[in-house]
């Protein structure tokens, strides 16, 4: 149930990226850590890296109130979950300084990417076989 | 915002090969999931399957062993293969886009198919 | 595979009514359910995802509740282009499987 809960958050915060996705022009073009091919077990890890990242609004034109509210959103930390926690643990993740930086746009897809492997593999492991290739 | 098209042939005969592509415009097939879903004559929403940009698939075990769905990125196109088609598989077929993974959020306006001889 | 049964399968309501119909799991699905509109030769609308989340750009005249089994779809002031048929989808496992659909007719 918990585990669910954190999944629906991912599913929703997905939606909040896209929307940011909208307004990648008035963020501020700074390169920040993003996470790619983030392997098995370090997608908590890699999520936290995601939501600890400097992403800012560059103060210009109407859209920064938006913008400021879709970026607190994405920073909101989710319920802890015993699957986190066990991530949380893990040495061997690569630390938030070690991925590749990239501008807001890359940053934002890759974000998305994440969100999407980690709902995916939910959706897949209460499913006998449902992979198929 | 993202458009998707369907096309392909209307008619196909009793044991031949349905094929189907699905072009998508206004945004990149490079990321997301992309499925069909199809609709027999009076009859509810069939989800068939989906393929995530990067290759990996998921198919309804009802249809699994004659489905294939393929994507081309350098054309921005997927494709559903679905073999041995018979009078039951006459639908309307829907390509969508999966953002989320769990739901589609944008549809194409859908193509009839009929098998008959 | 998780059945979704709708109902009612078609409701007859006026301009301005409240509609309210419901999506029953074959087995809980937490809150993993979609609700789409679809007309006549128009591609299906997104409206709701994860049972209660409004899809970008969905009056909000749209909401949807429930989680568990029972799920609910409400259009608290019908409007005219709110006549289609409306089908809920859950997302809990694969396959992913749709409800029978419910049309919502002029009265």
């Known amino acids: 149930q918990g585990q669910d809960r954190h999944m629906i958050r991912m599913r929703q915060l997905i939606d909040i990226v896209d929307q940011l996705k909208n307004y990648v022009n008035d963020l501020v073009p700074e390169f920040l850590p993003a996470p790619e091919d983030v392997e098995t077990n370090c997608e908590w890890s890699a999520f936290s890296c995601f939501q600890k990242a400097q992403l800012k609004s560059a103060n210009t034109g109407n859209n920064e109130r938006i913008i400021n509210v879709s970026i607190k959103k994405l920073k909101r930390k989710p319920p802890s979950t015993n699957a986190g926690r066990r991530q949380k643990h893990r040495l061997t993740c690569p630390s938030c300084d070690s991925y590749e930086k990239k501008p807001p746009k890359e940053f934002l897809e890759r974000f998305k990417s994440l969100l999407q492997k980690m709902i995916h593999q939910h959706l897949s492991s209460r499913t006998h076989g449902s992979e198929d290739s | 915002q993202v458009q998707l098209q369907e096309s392909g042939p209307g008619l196909v005969k009793p044991s031949e090969t349905l094929s189907l592509t699905c072009t998508v415009s206004?945004?990149?097939?490079?990321?997301?999931?992309w499925g069909w879903i199809r609709q027999p004559p009076g009859k509810g929403l069939e989800w068939i399957g989906y393929i995530y940009s990067r290759g990996s698939t998921n198919y309804n075990p009802s249809l699994k062993r004659r489905v294939t769905i393929s994507v081309d990125t350098s054309r921005n196109q997927f494709s559903l293969k679905l073999s041995s088609v018979t009078a039951a598989d006459t639908a309307v077929y829907y390509c969508a886009r999966s953002a989320g993974v769990t739901d589609f959020d944008f549809w194409g306006q859908g193509t009839l198919v009929t098998v008959s001889s | 595979d998780i059945q979704m049964t709708q109902s009612p399968s078609s409701v007859s309501a006026s301009v301005g009514d409240r509609v309210t119909i419901t999506c029953r799991a074959s087995q809980g699905i937490s809150s993993w359910l979609a609700w789409y509109q679809h007309k006549p030769g128009k591609a299906p609308k997104l409206l709701i995802y994860?049972?209660?989340s409004l899809q970008s750009g969905v009056p909000s005249r749209f909401s949807g509740s429930g989680s568990g089994t029972d799920f609910t779809l409400t259009i608290s002031s019908l409007q005219p282009e709110d006549f289609a048929t409306y089908y809920c989808q859950q997302a809990n496992s694969f396959p992913l499987t749709f409800g029978g659909g419910t049309k919502v007719e002029i009265k």
């Open positions: 206004g945004g990149s097939i490079s990321s997301d999931f």
């Open positions: 994860v049972a209660s």
